[in-house]
């Protein structure tokens, strides 16, 4: 058993049929010595008396808010949560496996630039009685500070018969130099509590590996005289690291109709303009990627050909 | 120890070209190592990230773009005596700082070259003959060093009398290639910045 936060404790249980469970001793936070009784949750049934209560925690029915009273007055609370371990593996029931970029990916993180600011998000099908808390650091043995905000519900989607909820959090490394060469990864730890179930999820990455620029901005078309070719120009996104001559991007320019299966024109360039063939009912799209370290491409920025 | 925006040496462009070749060569070599050594811990997640140039050179600091010198985190415990309230520096100081930056890059390349050659000598003794360093990568390191045109004492190639541990050597190769790729990215960024300045 360990303390998650004040008056909240996590009991780690090996979860299998007829498991013996864990013996837990609760102590009432009071100078009083006698006349103390214990109850669980909203029940008025007295579970025991005395300053300490010893319980055998085997299942969720044994978890919850234990309260010690004296003469009708509440003295203190202890909330017990369960963390299940099945076949030596901690449970991951609360969050959905996003399976990208690999299986057992519960947390996904992205950074728009090298400033040390990044966003992580996760998915769940649970809609109520759910709380998250996020911590992060650079390295684990001698951790350097990363400050994370509160996790918030960022999107709701309907997937078949189920509703899916996306939560996200923004974090900022306390002293980040965009030009630095990372040797220690960022560690992100998410504590998830659903009712009386506790789970924790972690992710470890270098900022350089989670870079995904914003789409290029200000796409403009200039038809070329006596030709089907069009000059398309754009600018670096505002959120990208500066100076741009140091943090350079490379671009992919594509002309395609509404369907992905339609024919297309595609060209890659390090410049902020390109010449392509425009077709009726097609659109020109441009996306960006770090020129020197190939992490993710940005989303497309698009303009119609017409 | 940082690079102000200045008119670069006319010989800068060849360095940009060579640095692009360097990044390409080390990326290809790293990809080849990952594929060939698939049963060894050779991915970014599996290896320890070591920098053989740590405390010996200061390329990131020496080559910091002027725009980043206002960022306290980039100057943390660095020698910053060259920054005069962010104003433009005299061209002599400018070229001195650029020289510091380029000589730091040269020293990086020299250190990696020695390490890679020593390692290749060991890998050539491996009866499995599983992996060797790409001669193209070694040639590209050499070309960039020549383009930088610095003279410094030659570092003797390390020779070891004991029987090499090929498993350890291959893991060290992965560590070295990952670190060198990150440094090659920095070098490419620096050359691009200097070329545009």
């Amino acid at each position: 058993i360990w303390e998650l936060k004040k008056d909240v404790y996590v009991v780690e249980l090996d979860w299998y049929p007829d498991a013996p469970g864990e013996m837990v001793v609760l102590t009432c936070d009071t100078p009083e010595e006698d006349g103390i009784t214990w109850t669980l949750d909203q029940s008025s049934e007295v579970l025991g008396s005395g300053k300490t209560l010893t319980i055998q925690v085997k299942e969720f029915g044994d978890a919850g808010q234990y309260t010690c009273h004296k003469g009708g007055e509440v003295l203190s609370h202890s909330l017990l949560l369960l963390h299940k371990k099945e076949d030596g593996i901690w449970s991951t029931d609360i969050l959905k496996d996003q399976k990208e970029p690999k299986n057992k990916t519960f947390l996904r993180c992205e950074a728009k630039n090298y400033s040390g600011r990044f966003t992580c998000w996760w998915l769940t099908t649970i809609s109520t009685d759910l709380t998250f808390s996020v911590k992060s650091s650079r390295g684990s043995s001698d951790p350097q500070g990363v400050t994370c905000g509160a996790a918030t519900l960022s999107a709701e989607r309907v997937r078949g018969d189920n509703k899916e909820y996306e939560y996200s959090v923004e974090c900022q490394e306390d002293s980040a130099c965009p030009a630095a060469e990372e040797s220690l990864p960022i560690e992100v730890m998410v504590d998830a509590v659903h009712k009386l179930k506790y789970e924790n999820y972690t992710s470890s990455f270098f900022i350089r590996d989670i870079i995904k620029p914003d789409p290029p901005k200000n796409l403009q078309l200039k038809p070329l005289k006596n030709s089907r070719q069009v000059e398309v120009s754009w600018e670096y996104p505002d959120t990208w690291s500066t100076p741009h001559s140091y943090f350079s991007l490379t671009f992919c320019v594509q002309v395609q109709g509404k369907s992905k299966r339609e024919k297309k024109d595609r060209v890659f360039t390090d410049k902020t303009s390109a010449t392509v063939i425009c077709r009726k009912n097609a659109s020109i799209s441009v996306r960006a990627q770090d020129r020197y370290y190939s992490s993710s491409w940005s989303e497309w920025a698009s303009v119609p050909c017409s | 120890r940082n690079l102000p925006v200045a008119t670069p040496d006319p010989g800068m462009f060849p360095c940009l070209h060579h640095s692009q070749n360097l990044l390409r060569a080390v990326s290809n070599m790293l990809q080849k190592a990952r594929q060939t050594l698939e049963f060894y811990p050779c991915t970014s997640e599996e290896i320890d990230h070591e920098d053989i140039t740590k405390d010996k050179t200061s390329t990131v600091e020496a080559c910091l773009p002027l725009e980043l010198t206002k960022n306290e985190s980039c100057l943390n415990s660095r020698e910053t005596s060259f920054i005069t309230n962010g104003s433009c520096l005299a061209s002599r100081k400018t070229s001195f700082m650029m020289a510091l930056c380029l000589s730091s890059i040269y020293e990086d390349l020299k250190m990696y070259q020695v390490e890679f050659k020593t390692m290749n000598a060991k890998l050539l003794m491996d009866p499995k003959r599983q992996i060797f360093l790409d001669q193209n990568m070694l040639a590209v390191i050499d070309e960039l060093m020549q383009a930088l045109n610095f003279n410094s004492e030659t570092v003797p190639q390390k020779s070891s009398l004991e029987e090499p541990d090929f498993y350890k050597t291959k893991i060290k190769l992965c560590i070295l290639l990952h670190a060198f790729r990150i440094r090659a990215v920095t070098i490419d960024r620096v050359m691009s910045y200097l070329n545009a300045s």
Epitope: T250, R261, K263, D265, R266, D270, R279 | -
Partner: antibody, heavy 118, light 107 residues
Framework: QVQLVQSGAEVEKPGASVKVSCKAS????????LHWVRQAPGQGLEWMGW????????EYAPKFQGGVTMTTDTSTSTAYMELRSLRSDDTAVYYC???????????WGQGTMVTVSS | EIVMTQSPATLSVSPGERATLSCRAS??????LHWYQQKPGQAPRLLIY???QSISGIPARFSGSGSGTEFTLTISSLQSEDFAVYYC?????????FGGGTKVEIK
């Protein structure tokens, strides 16, 4: 599977014209761009131009501008390349090539040998 | 127009050996570079597109790399069926242009 079948070899006199055909099968004809590439005996490849069978749009290499016409007949899924004012250095194997992507060539015809000789 | 230069013109290699073919562009073309193989009496066949992207059905021993002005096609271990002429082609701008070819012959 996607296939391009070209017409047979031609022998023409200098100053004449030649029209080579390229019949497509195994895909929707208008879904691919069609290019013509030629190769003189013992020489390399030379791109001549492309046509979009969907709308008849064409783009020719400057060298062939005015001397070549590319057309398509969507009813028979056939592309044509007509080269006018033939000279002896137009002797070559002419290939049609197709792709969903405009700028490179995924599928090739077997080639048509055109000999220009007096 | 962009001029593509391939080297060497002829490459003599023993079966099982590695072959490295070079292609250089007269100006930077990013990764807009494609490789073809042509055997005598046959049409060319696409091997690699956009400098390094492999094509399904093409053996894994063929790989491409490069960007900007310098590109490489590598055949890791030459098989008898790989002896042919190899062409690079740029798609950075029209007109599309090919290199002069590299003939890979048996040593």
């Amino acid at each position: 599977q996607v296939q391009l079948v070209q017409s047979g070899a031609e022998v023409e006199k200098p100053g004449a014209s030649v029209k080579v055909s390229c019949k497509a099968s195994g895909y929707t004809f208008t879904d691919y761009y069609l290019h013509w590439v030629r190769q003189a005996p013992g020489q390399g490849l030379e791109w001549m131009g492309w046509i979009d069978p969907e709308n008849g749009d064409t783009e020719y290499a400057p060298k062939f501008q005015g001397g070549v016409t590319m057309t398509t007949d969507t009813s028979t899924s056939t592309a044509y390349m007509e080269l006018r004012s033939l000279r002896s250095d137009d002797t070559a194997v002419y290939y049609c090539a197709a792709n969903k992507e405009l700028r490179y060539f995924d599928v090739w015809g077997q080639g048509t040998m055109v000999t220009v000789s007096s | 127009e962009i001029v593509m230069t391939q080297s060497p013109a002829t490459l003599s290699v023993s079966p099982g050996e590695r072959a490295t073919l070079s292609c250089r562009a007269s100006q930077s073309i990013s990764i807009n570079l494609h490789w073809y193989q042509q055997k005598p009496g046959q049409a060319p066949r696409l091997l690699i597109y956009f400098a390094s992207q492999s094509i399904s059905g093409i053996p894994a021993r063929f790989s491409g790399s490069g960007s900007g002005t310098e590109f490489t096609l590598t055949i890791s271990s030459l098989q008898s069926e790989d002896f042919a002429v190899y062409y690079c082609q740029q798609s950075n701008s029209f007109p599309l242009t090919f290199g002069g070819g590299t003939k890979v012959e048996i040593k």
